[in-house]
């Protein structure tokens, strides 16, 4: 069961896995959640009754019964990992800790104007896990305004001490705020010959890459495939680092693949979620349970529902045995990866999907696109919402996109004449407008946030956020779309779709069924030629066919221009304006969302 609250003055007895240092109990809970085996923890806060060397210790614990005996102890704070919970979790930690010195290897020292600048420096440095900044009130004159970048093997401090007039904090790489280059290439027939910081077993190079991405010290990796000549190294995933952050030596070797940590493009792809099945593959590990199951999918469900299960192997039933049910072996290991991988024994293996919630919800695979046709099917665009106004009568006003459990991104021009958020209703999971009746549930709008530089759609800044009164529970028919990552500015999107209930021609009416059209992006230069009387800025993006025929139109405003890249859908544009609809050589103009990511994050995380 999911227990989120912290237990004050309480210590869990026994079950210790390891001890780390964290600046708060809240962060100790996050560390526990991300640790492959931790289910419970005890954190020691600073207290006069407690030995200062034990302050800020975070003891990670495991238990077969998922609980441990409780003992009263002043200054101890205990709790449970979020592994048992179904809600979204994130390693992103923007907190700044005053008067705390987080110890690690100080590998870079420079002057910074503020703690924020120091944190940005840490976020944009490939090795940095956390930092300590000496403020201008720091007693020692020569250390004032010094920004120390630090790293450790675990990504957490080796110790934390009280120190007046300093502040500490963590890198914001896991908040998708790094400007570091995102290197997505995987190099076949390549071995990176740098120092190994760790090694694990993995079924393929993609899982190896994902493990590297969430390993604190890994910057790049080499994976030996199952055809690798040396049998003992098959399926071995070597996690690597180097002083420069890049591999120093590249050796051409057949049946090996190498690649990079995706820590600086984190929110564009699933990192924790290994959802594939591996046929004719057995994962070895500590056995948790053996259960009968009808299929490998059912086995994966059983593993996902068993909180301690990390991976599984399913052996299909022999003909007519056990009512056609096979054996489902639920397994675990110290690091979350199989201890060995064997091939040719007929098993089907895979991983728990429990960790998928550690990825941004928006990366979850959705229904495959329906090719051909213009009407959408249910669940095809689960981030699309219909925004209604109730004044003077209820009607569809604009489209919008779910980007968070309390946030809708839409166009500013939708709110011309809207006096109050009270007259707005947001409907999600809707395919046909006719589904919306008196009793259809909707989300009320608490606040409309319009970009303060917005004047009119044609001059840009046509972007607005709606804060909902209640949170959206994600399901197959209502879930968020990923924002484009700033590191992906150079991506050329080729699979883009515009959706909405808007007109199908200039003089028309709102459509009942959600419509979709695949539309190619047009360069801003090309777009500018088509709109001589307007200024097409880099904060706009255009899409359309030269011959016209497919476009957004009245009523689609505020809705998404969704582009699929690396199997993940991104909200590349917001339907904004255009000359007529689907006219020849008149592309649609959309708000270029990547240019507003900072604005969106600032507004949605202000609370």
């Amino acid at each position: 069961e999911c227990v989120t609250q912290l237990l004050k003055d309480t210590c869990f007895e026994g079950g210790d896995i390891t001890t780390v240092f964290t600046p708060s109990a809240k962060y100790c809970q996050v560390v526990c959640t991300y640790h492959p085996r931790c289910l419970l923890f005890t954190f020691t806060a600073e207290s006069p009754s407690e030995d200062p060397t034990r302050w800020f210790t975070c003891v990670l614990k495991d238990s077969v019964t998922e609980t441990l005996p409780r003992v009263n102890r002043t200054a101890a704070i205990s709790g449970y990992s979020f592994k048992q919970c179904s809600h979204q979790i994130s390693a992103c930690n923007k907190d700044i800790y005053v008067d705390l010195d987080m110890k690690g290897i100080n590998y870079n020292s420079s002057v910074a104007k503020s703690a924020q600048e120091c944190q940005e420096r840490c976020t944009d440095d490939v090795h940095c896990h956390f930092f300590t900044y000496a403020t201008r009130q720091f007693p020692s004159l020569e250390h004032r305004n010094i920004c120390l970048l630090k790293h450790t093997q675990t990504g957490t401090p080796t110790r934390i001490t009280k120190l007046d007039k300093v502040v500490s904090g963590f890198s914001l790489k896991s908040c998708a705020l790094s400007n570091l280059a995102c290197i997505r290439d995987i190099f076949p027939n390549t071995v990176f010959a740098d120092s190994n910081i760790d090694s694990v077993m993995a079924p393929d190079a993609f899982v190896c890459g994902r493990i590297c991405t969430h390993h604190p010290g890994c910057l790049f990796f080499t994976f030996f495939s199952q055809e690798w000549p040396k049998e003992s190294q098959r399926n071995l995933c070597l996690l690597k680092t180097s002083e420069s952050g890049l591999p120093s030596t590249r050796i051409k070797k057949s049946k090996a693949l190498s690649g990079f940590s995706l820590q600086s493009c984190r929110h564009s792809i699933p990192v924790f979620c290994h959802s594939s099945f591996y046929h004719d593959t057995d994962f070895l590990g500590e056995e948790l349970d053996i259960v009968a199951a009808k299929s490998h999918e059912a086995c994966q469900k059983l593993c996902t529902n068993a909180v301690r299960c990390q991976f599984f192997t399913y052996t299909p039933a022999q003909a007519s045995c056990n009512e056609g049910k096979g054996k489902c072996y639920l397994k675990l290991s110290s690091n979350g990866s199989p201890t060995k991988i064997l091939h040719g024994r007929g098993g089907i293996s895979g991983y728990t999907l429990r960790l998928c919630k550690m990825d941004n919800e928006c990366t979850t695979k959705i229904k495959p696109r329906i090719v051909g046709g213009t009407a959408s099917v249910r669940g095809e665009w689960p981030w699309q919402v219909t925004l209604h106004t109730t004044s003077p009568t209820q009607r569809h006003l604009c489209g919008g996109s779910i980007i968070g459990n309390q946030w809708i991104l839409t166009a500013a021009h939708c709110f011309y004449g809207v006096e109050s958020p009270k007259i707005l209703r947001v409907y999600s999971g809707i395919l046909n407008q006719s589904e919306i009746k008196e009793d259809t549930s909707f989300f009320g709008v608490q606040e409309i946030i319009i970009h303060d530089q917005y004047k009119m759609a044609e001059s840009g800044y046509d972007i607005a956020l709606l804060k909902l009164e209640t949170t959206v529970n994600y399901t197959d028919s209502q879930r968020p779309i990923c924002l484009p990552s700033k590191g992906d500015r150079n991506v050329i999107y080729t699979d883009c779709w515009v959706t909405g209930w808007g007109y199908r021609k200039l003089r028309d009416k709102i459509q009942n069924t959600l419509q979709k059209a695949k539309i190619p992006l047009v360069t801003n230069e090309e777009c500018q030629k088509r709109y001589r009387g307007h200024k097409i800025t880099h904060k706009m993006i255009c899409a359309g066919y030269r011959e016209g025929g497919k476009d957004a139109c009245k009523g689609d405003s505020g809705g998404p221009l969704s582009c699929k890249h690396n199997e993940v859908w991104h909200l590349v544009g917001i339907t904004s304006w255009g000359e007529g609809c689907a006219q020849r050589e008149r592309p649609g103009v959309y708000t270029n969302v990547v240019e507003y990511v900072d604005w969106i994050l600032e507004k949605t995380q202000a609370v």
Epitope: D124, V126, S178, N179, L180, A181, C182, I183, R184, D185, F187, L219, E243, S244, G245, L246, P247, S248, R250, N490
Partner: nanobody, 124 residues
């Protein structure tokens, strides 16, 4: 000693094209971030385009996307910048630069080796 030598700059009409080259000595392009930066009079130096030479990863400033193309020839240890549809606002001194390690691709502060620059002037 690392030396970067740019060439190919010049004057061109708006809408025209130029191809800049950067030859490196004492530094291998085979596994590094190398790129083009520019500085217009009275303005800060800004990133134009960068390439991670081991793979296919390229990074462009928004203002040049779709118009400029960065490429490399590892055998010749040379970096190129193909500039099409040039605009008056592209007028600047263009520098070739190379980094040491994994960097923010368009941040000049992260690049340690610099060429002398080549002037590009675009008139309307």
């Amino acid at each position: 000693q690392v030396q970067l030598q740019e060439s190919g700059g010049g004057s061109v009409q708006a809408g025209g094209s130029l191809r800049l080259s950067c030859a490196a000595s004492g530094y291998t392009f085979s596994n590094n971030f190398v790129g083009w930066f520019r500085q217009a009079p009275g303005k800060k130096r800004e990133g134009v385009a960068t390439i991670y030479t081991l793979g296919s990863s390229t990074y462009y400033a928004d203002s040049v996307k779709g118009r400029f193309t960065i490429s490399q020839d590892n055998a010749k240890n040379t970096l190129y910048l193909e500039m099409n549809s040039l605009k008056p606002e592209d007028t600047a001194m263009y520098y070739c630069a190379a980094a040491r390690g994994w960097v923010s691709p368009l941040d000049p502060a992260r690049f340690v080796y610099w060429g002398q620059g080549t002037q590009v002037t675009v008139s309307s």
